[in-house]
C-alpha cells in the first residue's frame, strides 16, 4: 500500500536512455504518442514530472521476495497525464486521469550503477519499463539474471526550476 | 527490531588486509542494500562503497577501487567488506548502513552498525 | 562528484535557541539530501531525508528544507540531548557524499 496518498517530493527531469536517446512525447489526434529518438543538437529535450511516493510491500505481493519500504515514482510529462503500464499489450501509454491515480501509473524506482534507474511495474513485479524498436515497452527480467540489461536502464537530467507542469 | 552489529576492533600492520563483518536481523537481509562509511579519528563521514544485499552489485569510490571488496552472505545476513594494503591513513571507526529504501538510495541510510575501530600501525 | 560545504562548522548554543544549520551543494539537485545526528562515540542517527521529510521516531522540532544547491536543518528549540555534531549527506548520485560536520555546542 502506498503510504500516503501525497507525494514526498516531486522533481522535474528529462528521461534519457542507457545510449543517451531522448524519451519524447507528441500529441497526435488528441492521444499522446511516446517516441525514443536521437534528438537535433538545438532541440529541447521534453520534461516529465516525476512524484515520488513511499510505499510498504509486503513480500507476498513482489515476486523476487523483496519486502520493505519501497520509492515508488508517477511520471508526467504534461498537465493530467501519467505513464501507465498495459500489461496486456506489454505496453507503456500515456493516459488522461484523475487522482487518485490508478495502480498501473506507478511504479517501483530502482537506482543502478552509473547513476540509471529503472522502473518496475508496481501491478506486475518483475516488469519494467523498456526500449523495444524505438518504442517503450514493458520488459519482463528474469530476477535471477543481472538487472543491469541496458534496454531497461534510463538516465534522469534533472532540471532545476520550480517543480511545476511547464506547458 | 532491526539491528547491524560488527565485527570487534582490529590492529593491523601496514600492507595487511582486515575484513570487517556487519550481521543484520530484524528484516529481510536480501530487500535493502548496506553501504560502508568511515571515520577517521576526529574527522568527518566518508561514504566508500555500496552493495546490493539482493544481487550482489557493488559500487566502490574510485579512491578505494582495487583495494576495497564488499561481499555478503544471505545464508547468515551478513555483509563483510575487506580493505587490503592498509596504510595509517586507514585508520578509523568502520560503519556498515543500512538504505532506507529496498531498491534505492535516494533515502540515506536508516539503521547503522555500531561501528569497528580498524588501527593501522607499525 | 557533488561536494557539500556545510556552515558553520561549530556553534554555541543554549537549551531553547533555535539553530540553524546550511548545506551547500557543488552542483544542484532536487531533493535528496539526508541529515544526521553523532554523538561522541556513536554510530549517526538519520534525522531527515528526501531534504524535508522527518524519519520515523524523530521529534518535531527537527525540520529540513530546500532544493537546488541549499540545504538547511533546523532546530526549533535546541534540547540538552541535541549538542552533538550534524552532517548532511547527498543521496542523489553515486559517489554519495557527506557535509564536513556542524558541532553544536553548549555556550
Known amino acids: 500500500s502506498i503510504t500516503g496518498i501525497s507525494p514526498i517530493t516531486e522533481s522535474l527531469a528529462s528521461l534519457s536512455t542507457y545510449n543517451d536517446q531522448s524519451i519524447t512525447f507528441a500529441l497526435e489526434d488528441e492521444s499522446y504518442e511516446i517516441y525514443v529518438e536521437d534528438l537535433k543538437k538545438d532541440k529541447k529535450k521534453d520534461k516529465v514530472l516525476l512524484s515520488y511516493y513511499e510505499s510498504q510491500h509486503p513480500s507476498s505481493e513482489s515476486g523476487d521476495g523483496v519486502d520493505g519500504k519501497m520509492l515508488m515514482v508517477t511520471l508526467s510529462p504534461t498537465k493530467d497525464f501519467w505513464l501507465q503500464a498495459n500489461n496486456k499489450e506489454h505496453s507503456v501509454e500515456l493516459h488522461k486521469c484523475e487522482k487518485p491515480l490508478p495502480d498501473q501509473a506507478f511504479f517501483v524506482l530502482h537506482n543502478r550503477s552509473f547513476n540509471c534507474v529503472s522502473f518496475e511495474c508496481k501491478t506486475d513485479p518483475g516488469v519494467f519499463i523498456g526500449v523495444k524498436d524505438n518504442h517503450l515497452a514493458l520488459i519482463k527480467v528474469d530476477y535471477s539474471e543481472n538487472l543491469g540489461s541496458e534496454n531497461i536502464l534510463f538516465k534522469l537530467s534533472e532540471i532545476l526550476e520550480h517543480h511545476h507542469h511547464h506547458h | 527490531q532491526v539491528q547491524l552489529v560488527q565485527s570487534g576492533a582490529e590492529v593491523k600492520k601496514p600492507g595487511a588486509s582486515v575484513k570487517v563483518s556487519c550481521k543484520a536481523s530484524g528484516y529481510t537481509f536480501n530487500s535493502y542494500g548496506i553501504s560502508w562509511v568511515r571515520q577517521a579519528p576526529g574527522q568527518g563521514l566518508e561514504w566508500m562503497g555500496w552493495i546490493s544485499s539482493h544481487n550482489g552489485n557493488s559500487h566502490y569510490v574510485q579512491k578505494f577501487q582495487g583495494r576495497v571488496s564488499m561481499t555478503t552472505d544471505t545464508s547468515t545476513s551478513t555483509a563483510y567488506m575487506e580493505l587490503r594494503s592498509l596504510r595509517s591513513d586507514d585508520t578509523a571507526v568502520y560503519y556498515c548502513?543500512?538504505?532506507?529504501?529496498?531498491?534505492?538510495?535516494?533515502?540515506?541510510?536508516?539503521?547503522w552498525g555500531q561501528g569497528t575501530l580498524v588501527t593501522v600501525s607499525s | 562528484d557533488i561536494q557539500m560545504t556545510q556552515s558553520p562548522s561549530s556553534v554555541s548554543a543554549s537549551v531553547g535557541d533555535r539553530v540553524t544549520i546550511t548545506c551547500r551543494a557543488s552542483q544542484g539537485f532536487s531533493s535528496w539530501l539526508a541529515w544526521y545526528q553523532q554523538k561522541p562515540g556513536k554510530a549517526p542517527q538519520l534525522l531527515i531525508y528526501?531534504?524535508?521529510s522527518l524519519q520515523s521516531g524523530v521529534p518535531s522540532r527537527f525540520s529540513g528544507s530546500g532544493s537546488g544547491s541549499d540545504f538547511t536543518l533546523t532546530i526549533s528549540s535546541l534540547q540538552p540531548e541535541d549538542f552533538a555534531t550534524y552532517y548532511c549527506?547527498?543521496?542523489?548520485?553515486?559517489?554519495?557524499?557527506f557535509g564536513g560536520g556542524t558541532k553544536v555546542e553548549i555556550k
Open positions: 549527506q547527498q543521496a542523489n548520485s553515486f559517489p554519495l557524499t
Open positions: 528526501a531534504a524535508s
Open positions: 548502513a543500512r538504505h532506507s529504501y529496498t531498491t534505492s538510495w535516494y533515502g540515506g541510510f536508516d539503521y
